[in-house]
Interface confidence: low
């Protein structure tokens, strides 16, 4: 028999799909970590639904998430970062669905920032640089970055370059002359931590020089 028999609003709760996904961000606010979860189905009625994490926590057994519109999140220093935690969707004291998750395997880095492109006339190349807050972190220091660029008119024709440093050189001859390019970058944990791509950095736009007819090179 359903545990919700006396509650008309919740009678059908067990028929719903409460599958969810989460990502962690370590040292996202000083030494504080965050954990964000959301339901896979955007139409789930989240009224009365709560998330709780238990296990692999420091000094406490469980923590409750805060709800912000359709997402649930925790900001805390209390993640042990060793072993699996049990994350449950709950109605009152009843767990509807649970997942065992190691928070070090669902890390989503912060988006890179300060992306810029400088043209070096003498070298006939473009130097792409960007910054990441992870250089200063204790935990998620080692990242793989994905630099994506495209000619502005080619809407879905992105060229991707993977690199571990925060500097990339694009050869002028590989780009179209007198064209406007859009470039952006994102990061994913590499080495010990695992997880997801960060959000993309804000895009940066740059124009390639025109071809100098006498030399066959761009201006």
């Amino acid at each position: 028999e359903s545990g919700y028999a006396q509650n008309g609003d919740l009678e059908d709760a067990e028929l719903d799909d409460y599958s969810f996904s989460c990502y962690s961000q370590l040292e996202v606010n000083g030494s504080q970590h965050s954990l964000t979860c959301a339901f896979e189905d955007p139409d789930v009625n989240t009224t009365n639904l709560e998330f709780e994490i238990c296990g692999a926590l420091v000094e406490v057994k469980c923590l409750n998430f805060r709800k912000l519109q359709e997402i649930y999140f925790i900001e805390t220093k209390k993640f042990l970062l060793i072993g699996k935690s049990n994350i449950c969707v709950k109605v009152g004291e009843k767990s509807l669905t649970c997942k065992k998750i190691d928070l070090t395997t669902i890390v989503k880095p912060e988006a890179p920032f300060d992306l810029s492109v400088i043209y070096r006339e003498g070298a006939n190349d473009f130097v792409v640089t960007f910054n990441t807050s992870h250089l200063q972190k204790k935990y998620v220091k080692v990242l793989m970055h994905d630099v994506a660029y495209r000619q502005e008119k080619d809407e879905n024709k992105w060229t991707h370059v993977n690199l571990s440093s925060t500097k990339l050189t694009l050869l002028q001859r590989k780009l179209q002359p007198a064209a406007m390019y859009e470039i952006k970058v994102r990061s994913i944990p590499d080495h010990y931590f695992k997880g997801f791509w960060s959000e993309w950095s804000p895009s940066y736009y740059f124009r390639t020089p025109e071809i100098n007819n006498s030399s066959g090179e761009m201006d």
Epitope: C54, G55, A56, L57, V58, E59, V60, K61, K78, L80, L81, I82, G83, K84, K100, D102, T104, T105, K138, Y139, Y192, K194
Partner: antibody, heavy 121, light 109 residues
Framework: EVQLVESGGGLVQPGRSLRLSCAAS????????MHWVRQAPGKGLEWVSG????????GYADSVKGRFTIFRDNAKNSLYLQMNSLRAEDTALYYC??????????????WGQGTTVTVSS | AIQLTQSPSSLSASVGDRVTITCRAS??????LAWYQQKPGKAPKLLIY???SLESGVPSRFSGSGSGTDFTLTISSLQPEDFATYYC???????????FGQGTRLEIK
């Protein structure tokens, strides 16, 4: 019943190798980090090595780094310690211990009875 | 690496005595400290975790306190079965690392 049973100890000459095994039962092995702790005759406890549930987090005491390798086989509920270039000072009773992280912090809540390693010529 | 120093190294006491063992960390470790009891020929047994939490099944005469660098294990009224060696233990989660104190041997006076 939660149980850890070590095996593989014995008498070995300096410079030789030995592999210790620890068979786990009574708990979900792949939910837990595992450790090797040793105790030389008449001495205190010395942590040797630890390995996270998924083998991605591994640590060694400075005294064994580069000589010992910890690994696990979750399908077999087994933990291992490969000991190479053994020295007389590695002579000890070697315990396998289960980590219980859900209590907050690292605690070794279940221990085996140990297997004795003697390094002597 | 963090060092743990226990004091005293050994002590003699009588049944019914109140006994205190201290453990000092070379740097702050919050409450990341556990205490173990070991009897001759036996594996260590967890007594206290997270500095002050009593492990299930451990008698309430055992208690732990402290935070940061200074920690204490107290046995309020010694029983005959309490004569053993006691160890404090600290952990670091990343990188994975565990440290034990050198032990305190508790003997019958």
């Amino acid at each position: 019943e939660v149980q850890l049973v070590e095996s593989g100890g014995g008498l070995v000459q300096p410079g030789r190798s030995l592999r210790l095994s620890c068979a786990a039962s009574g708990f979900t092995f792949d939910d837990h980090a595992m450790h090797w702790v040793r105790q030389a005759p008449g001495k205190g406890l010395e942590w040797v090595s630890g390995i996270s549930w998924n083998s991605r987090g591994i640590g060694y005491a400075d005294s064994v780094k580069g000589r010992f390798t910890i690994f696990r086989d979750n399908a077999k509920n087994s933990l291992y310690l490969q000991m190479n270039s053994l020295r007389a000072e590695d002579t000890a009773l070697y315990y396998c211990a289960k980590d219980e992280y859900s209590r907050g912090y690292y605690v070794l809540d279940v221990w085996g009875q140990g297997t004795t390693v003697t390094v002597s010529s | 690496a963090i060092q743990l120093t226990q004091s005293p190294s050994s002590l003699s006491a009588s049944v019914g005595d109140r006994v205190t063992i201290t453990c000092r960390a070379s740097q702050g470790i919050s409450s990341a400290l556990a205490w173990y009891q070991q009897k001759p020929g036996k594996a260590p047994k967890l007594l206290i975790y997270a500095a002050s939490s009593l492990e299930s099944g451990v008698p309430s005469r055992f208690s732990g306190s402290g935070s940061g660098t200074d920690f204490t294990l107290t046995i309020s009224s010694l029983q005959p079965e309490d004569f053993a060696t006691y160890y404090c233990q600290q952990f670091n989660s990343y990188p994975l690392w565990i440290t034990f104190g050198q032990g305190t041997r508790l003997e019958i006076k």
